[in-house]
Structures are given as structure tokens and as C-alpha cells.
Interface confidence: low
């Protein structure tokens, strides 16, 4: 499918509005720090040479790739070196690998200022008085924010914005019209961030043999009636979509993701009776739709898989004559039956089951050598399903704070060597397991628990990556997609790791303390918990509670005197050494 | 993988016959009810005809009926599209596609109808 002009083909494929938007997400994903203005500049610059190729396919430097074009726009931002350092090298390489040096220096944790959410009057002024400029700004920081934000759904993310300061700031009461949808969007888009953050992992550290191993299964699930040649025909096409966005291809990105969308609405009746109300809505809504849409309902009669994946004497040869074929079939019938597993437990049955194949198959008698392999999943399927089990168990007796605490206690004794932000976000995020997954019913426990910690684990690979310190977390992270959350379990108190010294500076808190919100609170009182932890791995249960207790009292106490500031210079010190001695 | 490759395009005059092929592979072809679609440069794509996994069952569209036959050969996971009495109107870039769908999962072949 080849254009004499790759840019003229996506400017009129997407659209003038989409096409710059996408651009603009695809420079702040690569240059985090260069300010909004240069950015938009670059983009209308880009813009405006699309819209001559498009007039004429032959006119000068039309013909060159989007790569050749966008790498040589970011090229010519003049504080390349002084903001980015050796980013600035990259202008050195020609395509292919200048966009690859491009890619390797995305930042996962840019050092930027947290987002500060202005006065609603404000905001509603702003927005009033160019609404073009407000709705870029926040692609803008958003995408600097988060560079592997999946740049399709971005768009359908800003289109929420804008509805909602169009609907609230005609309301009476606008802030508690837009507050609430701003803390939905700033949620869902941090979820939908680290969502896609490990498909691209999946994509750039393991391959796109295991991308397509997820979508089969994940699709399997919830297309149980379509056949397996359509879930191919998606996988296929969806590793395409997502192999081009982690790639920073964000225009072939949007544009594919659009095509598969209209391909799975004219073709509903073999794919999922779910389908229909999604397809009635507009492009970018739809999209969205089709991604987050629920299981379709099994076909009733399915038969047992036993019959041609174990009593069959052709499996080895089936297995012989096309082996990922094969593999991929044995995924998609065990997920379409199995709604009830969690994504990565479908992947490790099936790793589990090659790997019976791998042996057997090679065996005097292979049918009897394979014969019991169904009974060897059942340890792998109880592992998750007694995680799940004591997890909600103890969620609903702590509640989600002390939850979280619990599991900044476990994650610390673990893997010490971790910074302590990286360990509070982390922990934070596990921790919100439990309000997300255990109040579903018990066949939907699982899927929600085990996937979405995969996504917070990863969030924690990536962050490692960066400033590698721990040989276990780089095990656990490295060694096998699917086994890493059952890595991160299994690991024990660090025998190995020499106690931080302890430093009372980080134990030290003023009476600004006391006009944090809740949340604030709760990371700083998390935070010296991790240090605790830090210094005193060996603290059982019952001493952190204690010295936490105390904490927390001590912050009351100082909160609710006349003179704060005074209070806690007083009686800081005495926490200080009254934690200590409890923990000595 | 699903994989689809047509073959058996070409030029040829007002009048002519070709005929074009689709090898599958990747999948249960004998499973699954297939199609030709087409399309010219500049138009959407179009639905040519259809056939049932077993073969027995043919569809049409109106501009070729008569014209056009569709069959297949499971053994050889091979579909076909015999076309007679070719018009310059049906020059268009040729596909196969599983089901009944109009967009495009492969290179397809081109046919080019000219005196």
C-alpha cells in the first residue's frame, strides 16, 4: 500500500485536527523538557509542509519518510545539547537508528514539576478564551509526562476534557461539576498510561511472539465465538497498531487502530455480539469502546480440550507440522473457556504445556508421557487463586491504607536496595488492588487482580531499568515476562542487604505537615515507614505498627496545637528516639 | 499467523479470462466461508463473491454475476476466482479475504482490463 507522499497519505487519512495533535503527542513524547511553545511551533511547521504535499505528492521532500521528516524537525530545536545532553547525538545518525537513539532516550520518570491543578474560575477562563491552545497544552503535558501513552486513545482522552469544561463551566457550580471528572480523567489516564507502558515492554524487551501471545489469549476471552482465524486476523492487526505506537509511528499508529476498528464493526456478527453499541459512536469513542468492551458469553457445548490436545495421538505431529500454530490454537481454546484466569496464567499453562510437548514429543512413548499434562496445571492455577484469596482477605481487614502499608513492609524487606519514592509508588499502586478487584465476584477476582498487577510491576521494571541496584529485581523483571509477578512473590527477606544507617534528618517533619491533603499525608507517613523498614529490616510486624501508631499520633498531637512548628521541634526528637529504642 | 497470497493478476483485453488464486495458510481453511473483494484506486473497497467453508454455497455481487466463479479447493487450502469475459471496469487490485469482510489483511494481485 504505498503513497508517493507518506505524510500526504496520513494528513488526509486522519484529518487536519487528529494529524496535529498526533504530531504534537509525538514530539513531547520525544523531547520531555522543551517548552509548549516550541513545541507548537514545530508542529505548525510541520503541519503546513503536509498541507503543500498534499496539494502536490511531488513537490520537494515529500517523498521522505515520517521518520526523515519528524527527526529532522527535532533536529533543529536550538538548546538540543544544553537540555538534553547526549540526546543531541542522535542528530548525528542517519534513518533507521537516529529514531531508535530517539526511542532508548524516552524518559519513563522525567524530572518535571507535578502537574498543579489551577482555581476552576481559572481554568474555565482559560479555556474560554482559546480553547485550541488549552486542549493542546494538555496533550502537551500530558504526553511529556508519559511518553508511551498510547497516542490514539490520548486524543479520546482530551476529547473527554474538552466535553467536560465545555459542560461545567456553563453549570452553576462549576467545581463540583468539573472536579470530579478531572479526578476520573487524571485516574483512568494513569491507569491507561501503565496499561500500555507494558504492552510496549512486552513489545521491545520480549518480542512480538509474546505481544501476540497476550492478544490471543486476551481476545480469546473476550471473543469466545469467534473463530481462531479471526482472532489471528486481530492479533495481527493489533500487534501492528501497538508495534507502531511503542515504536513512536503515532500516525500509522492512529490510522491502523482506526482501520481495525472499522474492520471488527463490519465484521461483528464473527467476532462478539458485544460489539453493537460501540460501533454506533463516533471514531475515537469507538476505538475506546472496542478495547474496554466486556466478554462476550461462551458458546454453550464448547467440548473438552482433552480430546485434541492430550487423548489425540496426532498431537505431536500436529505440534510437529506447525508449532505456534498449534500453541496458539491450544491458547485460544483454554482462554475462550477460561474468562475466569487471569491473562498471565493462561501463558504460563501454555508455556507450560510446550514445554511438555518440547519433552514428550521427543520421548519412546509420547502419548504416555503427555497423557497426564492437564493434572501439572493445577498448581500453577491454585498459585493465584490462594494469592488472590489471602490478599482480599487481608485488604478487607486492614482497609486500603494499611494495606498498602502491609505491602510497603513486604516490598521493602524484599528489595531493599530500591529508592524509597520508587517503593512508595509501587507499593501504593499494589495496594490499590484490593478496592479495584476484590469486591468483584469471585470468577472475575483473578483476571482483574493478577493482570493489573502485572501493570504495576512493570511500572517497576521500567523505573529500574533506568538506575539499576537490585541482581533480584533485574531477575524478576528480565527472566520471563509471565513469571514475573510470581518472581516478586516468591522473593524473601534480602539476607544479603546491610541496614541503611539510620539519619534522623529523614525522620524529621515541620508543621507543613499539617496542611497536606490526605493523600500527602499518607506518602509521607509511608515514606518514613519504608526508611524504618530500611534501617531495621528485621522489625517484625507488631514494632512497625507501634512505632506507626506513634507517628501518627505525634502528627495529630502537632497539628492541633497553637504553636506547630514549636511541637514538632519539641517532639519530633522524642519520636525519634522513642521509635528507636522500640525497634532496637 | 494468518496469512493470505493471491496470485494470477495481470493485463489482459476487454473479453479475456484470467484466473486468480488465494493460498492460505495459518489457519483451518476448510473451516471458514471466504470471499473476493476488489478495489480500484481512488474507490472503496468492493465485495465480489463468497463461498461457504464446504463449497457448496456461491454469492454474487450484481456486476458480476454470470461473469465470475468462485471455488475452492480445502485440500489444497486454496481458493480461486475464475473471471470471463473480463470488462475494462473491472480493473482493480484483487484479494481474498476469510468471511464476508471488505477490508484488507494481505498484498492482493492486480488486474488490469485494456485494449
Known amino acids: 500500500d504505498t503513497h508517493k507522499s507518506e505524510v500526504a497519505h496520513r494528513f488526509k487519512d486522519l484529518g487536519e485536527e487528529h494529524f496535529k495533535g498526533l504530531v504534537l503527542v509525538a514530539f513531547s513524547q520525544y523531547l520531555q523538557q522543551c517548552p509548549f511553545e516550541e513545541h507548537v511551533k514545530l508542529v505548525n511547521e510541520v503541519t503546513e509542509f503536509a498541507k503543500t504535499c498534499v496539494a502536490d505528492e511531488s513537490a520537494e521532500n515529500c517523498d521522505k519518510s515520517l521518520h526523515t521528516l519528524f527527526g529532522d524537525k527535532l533536529c533543529t530545536v536550538a538548546t538540543l545539547r544544553e537540555t538534553y545532553g547526549e540526546m543531541a547525538d542522535c542528530c548525528a545518525k542517519q534513518e533507521p537508528e537516529r529514531n531508535e537513539c530517539f526511542l532508548q532516550h524516552k524518559d519513563d520518570n522525567p524530572n518535571l514539576p507535578p502537574l498543579v491543578r489551577p482555581e476552576v474560575d481559572v481554568m474555565c477562563t482559560a479555556f474560554h478564551d482559546n480553547e485550541a491552545t488549552f486542549l493542546k497544552k494538555y496533550l502537551y503535558e500530558v504526553a511529556r509526562r508519559h511518553p508511551y501513552f498510547y497516542a490514539p486513545e490520548l486524543l479520546f482522552f482530551a476529547a473527554r476534557y474538552k466535553a467536560a469544561f465545555a459542560e461545567c463551566c456553563q453549570a452553576a457550580d462549576k467545581a463540583a461539576c468539573l472536579l470530579p471528572k478531572l479526578d476520573e480523567l487524571r485516574d483512568e489516564g494513569k491507569a491507561s498510561s501503565a496499561k500500555q507502558r507494558l504492552k510496549c515492554a512486552s513489545l521491545q524487551k520480549f518480542g512480538d511472539r509474546a505481544f501476540k501471545a497476550w492478544a490471543v489469549a486476551r481476545l480469546s476471552q473476550k471473543f469466545p465465538k469467534a473463530e481462531f482465524a479471526e482472532v489471528s486476523k486481530l492479533v495481527t492487526d493489533l500487534t501492528k497498531v501497538h508495534t507502531e505506537c511503542c515504536h513512536g509511528d503515532l500516525l500509522e499508529c492512529a490510522d491502523d487502530r482506526a482501520d481495525l476498528a472499522k474492520y471488527m464493526c463490519e465484521n461483528q456478527d464473527s467476532i462478539s455480539s458485544k460489539l453493537k453499541e460501540c460501533c454506533d459512536k463516533p471514531l475515537l469513542e469507538k476505538s475506546h469502546c472496542l478495547a474496554e468492551v466486556e466478554n462476550d458469553e461462551m458458546p454453550a457445548d464448547l467440548p473438552s480440550l482433552a480430546a485434541d490436545y492430550v487423548e489425540s495421538k496426532d498431537v505431536c505431529k500436529n505440534y510437529a507440522e506447525a508449532k505456534d500454530v498449534f500453541l496458539g490454537m491450544f491458547l485460544y481454546e483454554y482462554a475462550r473457556r477460561h474468562p475466569d484466569y487471569s491473562v498471565m496464567l493462561l501463558l504460563r499453562l501454555a508455556k507450560a504445556y510446550e514445554a511438555t510437548l518440547e519433552k514428550c514429543c521427543a520421548a519412546a512413548d509420547p502419548h504416555e508421557c503427555y497423557a497426564k499434562v492437564f493434572d501439572e496445571f493445577q498448581p500453577l492455577v491454585e498459585e493465584p487463586q490462594n494469592l488472590v484469596k489471602q490478599n482480599c482477605e487481608l485488604f478487607e481487614q486492614l482497609g486500603e491504607y494499611k494495606f498498602q502499608n502491609a505491602l510497603l513492609v513486604r516490598y521493602t524487606k524484599k528489595v531493599p536496595q530500591v529508592s524509597t519514592p520508587t517503593l512508595v509508588e509501587v507499593s501504593r499502586n499494589l495496594g490499590k488492588v484490593g478496592a479495584k478487584c476484590c469486591k468483584l465476584p469471585e470468577a472475575k477476582r483473578m483476571p482483574c487482580a493478577e493482570d493489573y498487577l502485572s501493570v504495576v510491576l512493570n511500572r517497576l521494571c521500567v523505573l529500574h531499568e533506568k538506575t539499576p541496584v537490585s541482581e533480584k529485581v533485574t531477575k524478576c523483571c528480565t527472566e520471563s515476562l509471565v513469571n514475573r509477578r510470581p518472581c516478586f512473590s516468591a522473593l524473601e527477606l534480602d539476607e544479603a542487604y546491610v541496614p541503611k544507617a539510620f539519619n534522623a534528618e529523614t525522620f524529621t517533619f515541620h508543621a507543613d505537615m499539617c496542611t497536606l491533603s490526605e493523600k500527602e499525608k499518607q506518602v509521607k507517613k509511608q515514606t518514613a515507614l519504608v526508611e524504618l523498614v530500611k534501617h531495621k529490616p528485621k522489625a517484625t510486624k507488631e514494632q512497625l505498627k507501634g512505632v506507626m501508631d506513634n507517628f501518627a499520633a505525634f502528627v495529630e498531637k502537632c497539628c492541633k496545637a497553637d504553636d506547630k512548628e514549636a511541637c514538632f521541634a519539641e517532639e519530633g526528637p522524642k519520636f525519634v528516639a522513642a521509635s528507636q529504642a522500640a525497634l532496637a | 499467523q494468518v496469512q493470505l497470497q493471491e496470485s494470477g493478476g495481470g493485463l489482459v483485453q476487454p473479453g479475456d479470462s484470467l484466473r486468480l488464486s488465494c493460498a492460505a495458510s495459518?489457519?483451518?481453511?476448510?473451516?471458514?466461508?471466504m470471499s473476493w473483494v476488489r478495489q480500484a484506486p481512488g474507490r472503496e473497497p468492493e465485495w465480489v463473491s463468497a463461498?461457504?467453508?464446504?463449497?457448496?454455497?456461491?454469492r454474487y455481487a450484481e456486476s458480476v454475476k454470470g461473469r465470475f466463479t468462485i471455488s475452492r479447493d480445502n485440500a489444497k487450502k486454496t481458493l480461486y476466482l475464475q473471471m470471463n469475459t473480463l470488462k475494462p471496469e473491472d480493473t482493480a487490485v484483487y484479494y481474498c479475504?476469510?468471511?464476508?469482510?471488505?477490508?484488507?489483511g494481505s498484498q492482493g494481485t492486480q488486474v488490469t482490463v485494456s485494449s
Open positions: 463461498i461457504d467453508s464446504g463449497g457448496a454455497d456461491t
Open positions: 495459518g489457519f483451518t481453511f476448510g473451516s471458514f466461508g
Open positions: 479475504t476469510i468471511g464476508r469482510s471488505t477490508s484488507r
